[in-house]
């Protein structure tokens, strides 16, 4: 199976100035004893073996290399130098590889488990001998290091001065190219097929390619403005309509086939316009109004659809009252007209100012269009009056008025008087004759259900949770900010995220270090130290193992019989005494009179028998919540997340590289950062816009809904389009009502329902 990551060790120098083995013998010496004059030059054929295992406060060189092991070929003689890790060394090694050489000093140990961060490294230098399999005789040096390391490209330098040799090396842990997080157990491999269309960001989160969205980037982003209630898409940029819907954005219903003078709100309807009826709205219910069939003053009455009846005045008959009988008896001539009977009926001779078959029509002195400049002519008996537009005056509106005196321009740089009008030079973002209409810059730019807020000369997309960017085009993964601490795995959910914590951690962000010492797993009275996600048992001398449950042999070779305080019987047939070891490995025995003794302890030990390790943690030297582990005449600090250094007193800068978007300012915290966002932005990294659906997104009283991929306007009757700006009835096309007014059409006429603060026929 493929590894999740790699532990890499680059050996850069080894100095064995005397060319000897750990035993003191020469590398190539017969019988392997040191020669009087020292060992010769380059007698050692040095290679290195590496063992990687779980963290041990007290390193034991034996036992399995539980995390893996590796070895180099023979690297040189007694001493040698290799290119160090880092940029210069990488270039040198690249040149060597180009020449077909392997990188000799590099040991790569792959691992197929979540990297635990803490580890023990044992490095051994050996002398190569063709005739011998490796045994302790050929060991030049053994050094060890126990610590913590996180996956990163940077190398960490280690220097060791052993009994015989000095070693310099660099180590690092790197995740495999498809694995991420502090433990290399988050998988992400870019792909572009039906299982997902994504690349991977620096945290291993899926970053959808253009045109795709969703947790796995399998869902296509439809054409902007596509009404997802009645349409959708399986490939990006399309808008395929559900049965019964049509139009570019699938927001127009399909009317009943054959519908003539009707429309629909839902598919397959045929809702008739005024004065039309029948299943297909093809029956004229107002034949009288549309055809005026009755002549000679007959009264028209609508009957069945497409039918009518004429009620004729006295003296007239026929279907349309077209036949006259004794026409003048009923005095049909109005306004002083004189009646004369003629074969077809009667004729009226009208006085001045009147006309028509019954002198009922006032002669229209306005017929000659006497009013100039678009003035409205009002016909009067024997005359007319001109009602002039604001910019003209005079009896026939022939004189130019200076409209700028009335300061008509609202949001303008200036007003210019023109002949027959005026011109307002509008500030950007405003339009209309008086610069009174805010230009609606919202044209469906906001994706993923974002709500468009119209601003002056601009717009702002208010994105739903989980999306950001100027057009809500960026799918925001709540896991992108790596909120889970302690190597927790982040799972992005529709309404947030969930942290799956490693063993030893809990809390919503895995920020709570579970006290693994409660209850204590340590046996035989060992003290328990709680570490980050782990524990350590400080075993007494006579027990070992992770939980101090493995007994150690206190007196190898059997017990001794004390003769004097510091000696023991050497055994039968052997004269003299041997050291009893009563002061243990950490003390020197001094005989006192009368067979007594006292122990002079090595540095770091105390007690009658020098068996007690002085607790170097008593002064609580570890800062910022670091866990102190007592060692021999020393201590080690295990630092909580966010702190490093020997005493856990160094706080690395989490603002490098800068995580804040949209000009947010970054403030470094402990194992965290805070972004102070500019106005209009929010979120951990200022990636999300602030505002929600407002009253201006949908026109004409439409209701705005978030609908996943785009906003949706539920339009009132008579309106359609993605923002309810397209009228269904012809009298409202194009919309005559300004300033947000709602147009209500009936047949060929319309009326405007104005917003508060506006009035007039068209809300001007």
């Amino acid at each position: 199976a493929r590894p999740m990551g790699y532990f890499e060790l680059q050996l850069s120098a080894l100095r064995n100035v005397n060319g000897e083995l750990l035993s003191g013998a020469c590398c190539d010496g017969d019988g392997r004893t040191t020669r009087a004059g020292g060992c010769g030059h380059d007698e050692c054929d040095t290679y290195v073996r590496v063992c990687l295992k779980e963290y041990q406060a007290k390193v034991t060189p034996t036992g399995p290399c539980s995390y893996g092991h590796g070895a180099t070929p023979v690297l040189g003689g007694n001493s040698f130098y290799l290119p160090p890790a880092g940029a210069a060394g990488d270039r040198a090694r690249a040149r060597a590889r180009a020449g077909g050489d392997q990188d000799p000093g590099l040991v790569v140990i792959p691992f197929q488990f979540a990297w635990p961060r803490s580890f023990t490294l044992i490095v051994e230098a050996w002398d190569w001998d063709n005739d011998t399999t490796p045994n302790e005789e050929l060991l030049i040096e053994r050094v060890s290091h126990a610590g913590m390391i996180n996956p990163e490209d940077r190398w960490k330098s280690l220097h060791f001065s052993g009994h015989v040799a000095h070693l310099e090396l660099q180590i690092r842990v790197r995740c495999d190219e498809n694995y991420y997080s502090a433990t290399c157990n988050k998988f992400c491999r870019p792909r572009n097929d039906f299982f997902g269309h994504y690349t991977c960001d620096q945290y291993g989160n899926k970053a959808c390619m253009d045109g795709w969205m969703g947790k796995e980037c399998k869902e296509a982003v439809c054409k902007q403005g596509c009404n997802l209630l009645h349409g959708g898409c399986t490939v990006p940029g399309e808008c395929r309509c559900s049965y019964g819907w049509q139009g570019r954005f699938c927001d127009e219903c399909v009317p009943y086939p054959g519908c003539v003078h009707g429309s629909c709100v839902e598919p397959w309807q045929c809702n008739c316009e005024t004065n039309w009826g029948g299943l297909l709205c093809d029956k004229d219910l107002n034949y009288c109004g549309s055809h005026h069939p009755c002549t000679n003053g007959g009264t028209c009455i609508n009957a069945e659809p497409d039918q009518y009846r004429c009620t004729c005045p006295d003296g007239y008959s026929g279907r349309n009252c077209e036949k006259a009988e004794h026409a003048c008896t009923s005095n049909p001539c109005a306004n002083g007209g004189s009646c004369h009977e003629v074969p077809s009926g009667f004729e009226c001779h009208c006085p001045s100012g009147w006309s028509g078959p019954t002198c009922a029509l006032d002669i229209d002195e306005c017929a000659s269009n006497p009013c100039a400049a678009g003035g409205t002519c009002v016909d009067q008996v024997d005359g007319f009056e001109c009602i002039c537009p604001e910019q003209w005056v005079g009896a026939t509106c022939q004189l130019d008025a200076n409209e700028c005196e009335g300061k008509p321009c609202l949001n303008a740089f200036s007003c210019k008087n023109l002949i027959g009008g005026y011109y307002c030079d509008c500030i950007p973002g405003w339009k209309g004759i008086n610069c009174h209409i805010n230009v609606n810059d919202c044209r469906g730019q906001c994706q993923h259900g974002g709500t468009c807020k119209d601003l002056v000369n601009g717009y702002q997309c208010v994105c739903p949770r989980g999306f950001g960017g100027r057009h809500c085009e960026l799918e925001r993964d709540e896991c992108a900010s790596s909120p889970c601490h302690s190597g927790g795995l982040c799972e992005d959910l529709a309404d947030g995220f969930h942290c799956h914590c490693p063993q030893g951690f809990s809390g919503p962000l895995c920020e709570v270090d579970v006290d693994l010492c409660e209850p204590s797993p340590c046996r035989n009275g060992a003290r328990c130290y709680n570490l980050e996600g782990d524990y350590y048992c400080a075993c007494p001398d006579d027990f070992g193992g992770k939980n101090c449950s493995v007994p150690r042999e206190p007196c190898p070779g059997g017990a001794c019989r004390v003769i004097d305080g510091c000696g023991s019987d050497a055994g039968p047939g052997m004269p003299g005494t041997a050291a009893s070891g009563v002061c243990g490995p950490h003390g020197r025995c001094v005989s006192q009179p009368g067979g007594n003794f006292s122990c002079i302890c090595d540095s770091g030990f105390t007690g009658t028998y020098c068996h007690e390790n002085i607790d170097d943690c008593l002064g609580q030297p570890c800062r910022n919540g670091g866990t102190c582990i007592d060692e021999v005449d020393a201590f080690r600090c295990f630092c909580p997340s966010g702190w490093e250094g020997e005493l856990c007193d160094t706080n690395p800068n989490d603002c490098l590289p800068d995580p804040c978007h949209s000009r947010g300012r970054c403030y470094d915290l402990v194992n965290d950062f805070y972004c102070a966002c500019d106005d209009g932005w929010k979120g951990k990294t200022c990636h999300s816009r602030e505002f929600q659906c407002d009253a201006y997104t949908c026109s004409n009283g439409g209701t705005c809904y978030d609908s996943g991929d785009t906003f949706r306007c539920a339009c009132p009757p008579g309106w359609k389009g993605s923002t309810c700006a397209v009228a269904k009835n012809s009298s409202c096309l194009p919309n005559p009502c300004v300033n947000g007014g709602t147009c209500v059409g009936s047949g060929a006429s319309f009326s405007c329902i104005c917003r508060d603060g506006w009035e007039g026929r068209t809300c001007t």
Partner: antibody
């Protein structure tokens, strides 16, 4: 040598369950997707579903959603198809197939297939 | 779901003939189309992936072309072992779908 071997097919009554296995060898199991494709007698190929063993992502055809479950055991290099509530129309030869993928090419195709195992749903 | 329509559903040809099979997608599938050959009682074999790339080990007489909605599999000179059923498959969007197959028979 790359090999995929299906097993677990047989006769089952309508409404019953069956579990198919696909044992993989000769390649890095977590570097590929494993898909199940079926072929009814005398008919064409129909995709059933698939899994990405590295992260456990799965996807299913609408016709089997809610009834079939695909899983993978990376320690055994084996993928499984658990079939519940079986119907007569699920009768087919079931193949498991390996699918490589790469961000640089759109759709890489299923390059290795097993020999197939017959599932018969009948009372 | 995207429909993949193959034509013809069957054809008769002689050894040495040039054979062309077409596949039309109901929507744009970029170049995410693969072609398979299947013989009776056997599992399908991959011939072409990403519309035009010849899979390793497949004879060079097989070639593929197309993008968007129209795709073609061409056998430049039909050999006796090429008599089989051929399927196209799109893998651009879920669920992946196969064509109904084209059976190539001996004339």
């Amino acid at each position: 040598e790359v090999q995929l071997v299906e097993s677990g097919g047989g006769l089952v009554q309508p409404g019953g369950s069956l579990r198919l296995s696909c044992a993989a060898s000769g390649f890095t199991f977590t570097s590929y997707d494993i898909h199940w494709v079926r072929q009814a007698p005398g008919k064409g190929l129909e995709w059933v579903g698939g899994i990405s063993p590295a992260d456990g992502d799965t996807d299913y055809a609408n016709s089997v959603k809610g009834r079939f479950t695909i899983s993978a055991d990376t320690s055994k290099n084996t993928a499984y198809l658990q079939m519940n509530s079986l119907r007569a129309e699920d009768t087919a030869v079931y193949y498991c197939a390996r699918n490589d993928y790469d961000v640089r090419s759109v759709g890489s195709g299923m390059d290795y297939w097993g020999q197939g195992t017959l599932v018969t749903v009948s009372s | 779901d995207i429909q993949m329509t193959q034509s013809p559903s069957s054809l008769s040809a002689s050894v040495g003939d040039r054979v062309t099979i077409t596949c039309r997608a109901s929507q744009d599938v970029s170049t995410a189309v693969a072609w398979y050959q299947q013989k009776p009682g056997k599992a399908p074999k991959l011939l072409i992936y990403s519309a035009s790339f010849l899979y390793s080990g497949v004879p060079s007489r097989f070639s593929g072309s197309g993008s968007g909605t129209d795709f073609t599999l061409t056998i430049s000179s039909l050999q006796p072992e090429d008599f089989a059923t051929y399927y196209c498959q799109q893998s651009y969007t879920t669920p992946p779908t196969f064509g109904q197959g084209t059976k190539v028979e001996i004339k």
